[in-house]
């Protein structure tokens, strides 16, 4: 059975939008006006994952691209990357764990915790134009809270 997905954009809690920075990286920066069209549109898929009270397992693909955010170890550190997949096989209900994020939503603020690396979150820097990354701290300098905007399919 096909997995259910919704198209959306994400902005961090400082209202920075996410845009492509090269073929396999996202960066966060403030956009306005027509520049808003640069922001990436995600296809958020609702996938299978471990049972948890307040966490919803999702995968975050780039709309109409065969790229998914994934979490892997690089130099022994959990790292966020954009990974290319075979579009014939993705998205699917049972995504590999590296593609799965636990969406935690409180008062319309979203966090995305790596299922592969608990307590590591999709993060942005306070600074402008910096890469989106996987961060191991919450509530510090780096930003782990996002808002979501629906996009028409």
């Amino acid at each position: 059975a096909p997995v259910r997905s919704l198209n959306c954009t994400l902005r961090d809690s400082q209202q920075k939008s996410l845009v492509m920075s090269g073929p396999y990286e996202l960066k966060a920066l403030h956009l306005q006006g027509q520049d808003m069209e640069q922001q990436v549109v995600f296809s958020m898929s609702f996938v299978q994952g471990e049972e948890s009270n307040d966490k919803i397992p999702v995968a975050l693909g780039l709309k109409e691209k065969n790229l998914y955010l994934s979490c892997v170890l690089k130099d022994d550190k959990p790292t966020l990357q954009l990974e290319s997949v075979d579009p014939k096989n993705y998205p699917k209900k049972k995504m590999e764990k590296r593609f799965v994020f636990n969406k935690i939503e409180i008062n319309n603020k979203l966090e995305f915790e790596s299922a592969q690396f608990p307590n590591w979150y999709i993060s942005t820097s306070q600074a402008e134009n910096m890469p989106v990354f996987l961060g191991g701290t919450k509530g510090g300098q780096d930003i782990t809270d996002f808002t979501m905007q629906f996009v028409s399919s």
Epitope: A1, R4, L6, N7, C8, F46, Q48, E51, I56, V58, K93, K103, E105, N108, F150, V151, S152, S153
Partner: antibody
Amino acid sequence: QVQLVQSGAEVKKPGSSVKVSCKASGYTFDRYWIEWVRQAPGQGLEWMGEILPGSGDINYNEKFKGRVTITADKSTSTAYMELSSLRSEDTAVYYCARMYYDYDQGFDLWGQGTLVTVSS
Amino acid sequence: DIQMTQSPSSLSASVGDRVTITCKFSQDIDRFLSWFQQKPGKAPKSLIYRVKRLVDGVPSRFSGSGSGTDFTLTISSLQPEDFATYYCVQYDEFPYGFGGGTKVEIK
């Protein structure tokens, strides 16, 4: 107060159409699917389709495809279900219900129901 | 479409009895299962979502369990206000489907 309020009962002739409304209040209309479910007299529940007002995504039960149209008006927080080519078997109570966009909480709030009677 | 069977279709029980209702599916429906209560002439009322999570305000005598294809609603000690019809629903795959219902009657 969080609620879904549906339009009143309708009596329709076979072959005609009916449009049932479902007005939401007390929550963010955009972020919840509005589900449409019907229940024929003395029968069980049957899912007809859904709409997510925030994105415009719509999913229909194939059984009703071509006969049912689901829409939403974000400005009034109202969803609509129109059923055409009515026949006597469409006599039922039609319910709207809501479900969060991520499907987490199931059909957690229901309208009071709208009785549609199809009779010549 | 996912095939489903809810059983029993009806049962007679007394106040204080433990009541169990089951829903079986033709394929894995992950966590997307809810249970409802419906009284005559009224809209359904949600009791349990995501298999086992109790809706706010629903008494703790109601509980849900199961995984994969087999799911259960249990009422640990039936109360007078629990005499009603109960339905399961899967919302894992289109078309979403409701069980045929279980009418709980007074013995």
